[in-house]
């Protein structure tokens, strides 16, 4: 696309509410976009007393808040639902909370895939 940013064509997909919403629970999502618009991946999660509950992952539309972010980093201090977005294929596999006000960085790794 000539602007130097990482192109996003596929993201990790996840929906914790998949049964009610009748979607897939997890997988890969191919991102479809309009010409001249950037695409991103996102992750959203809750943190209940240190226990991470993944909410959703997938593709995200052109959003200046996500530009040139190779890693998915949430910066809000203590939201009900954390959100991060990034550019580059599958960049939402790992996600991090790094509050702007300072404090410890917490990175969440996906669980290892069981061998088939």
């Amino acid at each position: 696309s000539g602007r130097g940013e990482a192109e996003t064509r596929e993201c990790i997909y996840y929906n914790a509410n998949w049964e009610l919403e009748r979607t897939n629970q997890s997988g890969l999502e191919r991102c479809e976009g309009e010409q001249d618009k950037r695409l991103h991946c996102y992750a959203s999660w809750r943190n209940s007393s240190g226990t991470i509950e993944l909410v959703k992952k997938g593709c995200w539309l052109d959003d200046f808040n996500c530009y040139d972010r190779q890693e998915c980093v949430a910066t809000e201090e203590n939201p009900q639902v954390y959100f991060c977005c990034c550019e580059g294929n599958f960049c939402n596999e790992r996600f991090t909370h790094l509050p702007e006000a300072g404090g410890p960085e917490v990175t969440y790794e996906p669980p290892p895939t069981a061998p088939t």
Epitope: N17, L20, E21, R22, T23, E29, C31, E32, G33, E34, S44, R46, V55, K56, G58, C59, W60, L61, D63, N65, P79, Q80, V81, Y82, F83
Partner: antibody
Framework: EVQLLESGGGLVQPGGSLRLYCAAS????????MSWVRQAPGKGLEWVSA????????YYADSVKGRFTISRDNSKNTLYLQMNSLRAEDTAVYYC????????????WGQGTLVTVSS | DIQMTQSPSSLSASVGDRVTITCRAS??????LNWYQQKPGKAPKLLIY???VLQSGVPSRFSGSGSGTDFTLTISSLQPEDFATYYC?????????FGGGTKVEIK
Amino acid sequence: EVQLLESGGGLVQPGGSLRLYCAASGFTFGAYAMSWVRQAPGKGLEWVSAISGSGDDTYYADSVKGRFTISRDNSKNTLYLQMNSLRAEDTAVYYCARQLIPPAPLDYWGQGTLVTVSS
Amino acid sequence: DIQMTQSPSSLSASVGDRVTITCRASQGISRFLNWYQQKPGKAPKLLIYGVSVLQSGVPSRFSGSGSGTDFTLTISSLQPEDFATYYCQQSFSSLFTFGGGTKVEIK
């Protein structure tokens, strides 16, 4: 230019059926999820139903579940809403709208078609 | 379902005024919040998505902010063409819900 054109609205008696159509042009129809949203006279917007780009996944508001069926024909660039067991409270302007990738917003809307349920 | 509550339901303002509309979700919806404008007899038009991202062609006097459950649409200097009804909508759940709308009228 993206265009969505609804048709099929009209006057129907309570308990009757109606099929709405939304003809799409100006974009790759099968790449987009599509929704129906309605607006009763003088009231706000109410989301009714949605369907994935492939047509495999469908979603319904509780108020229409079991009575309305959303479907699409990507070869004809057309979205449908089959409405059965219609009630007076279904009277509204029905809009079709496109959605790129959930959780994207509804970025283009048709001009709407009026459905009136009355005896 | 996620309930969306908008306030006020209507307001009167003059050209040049700063106008603020609020939207509250019944549960945390992160950044999955969109705003629409509707004029009488017309289809809704997308203004803002992802809380704060202006849709192409929308004037910069419109802005959005907030997170979690509380969100705001601001018009920094109201123009004659801005008199309309504004709706918030959540896309956190595939079962979309809209706020009840805020009608912006001429004072």
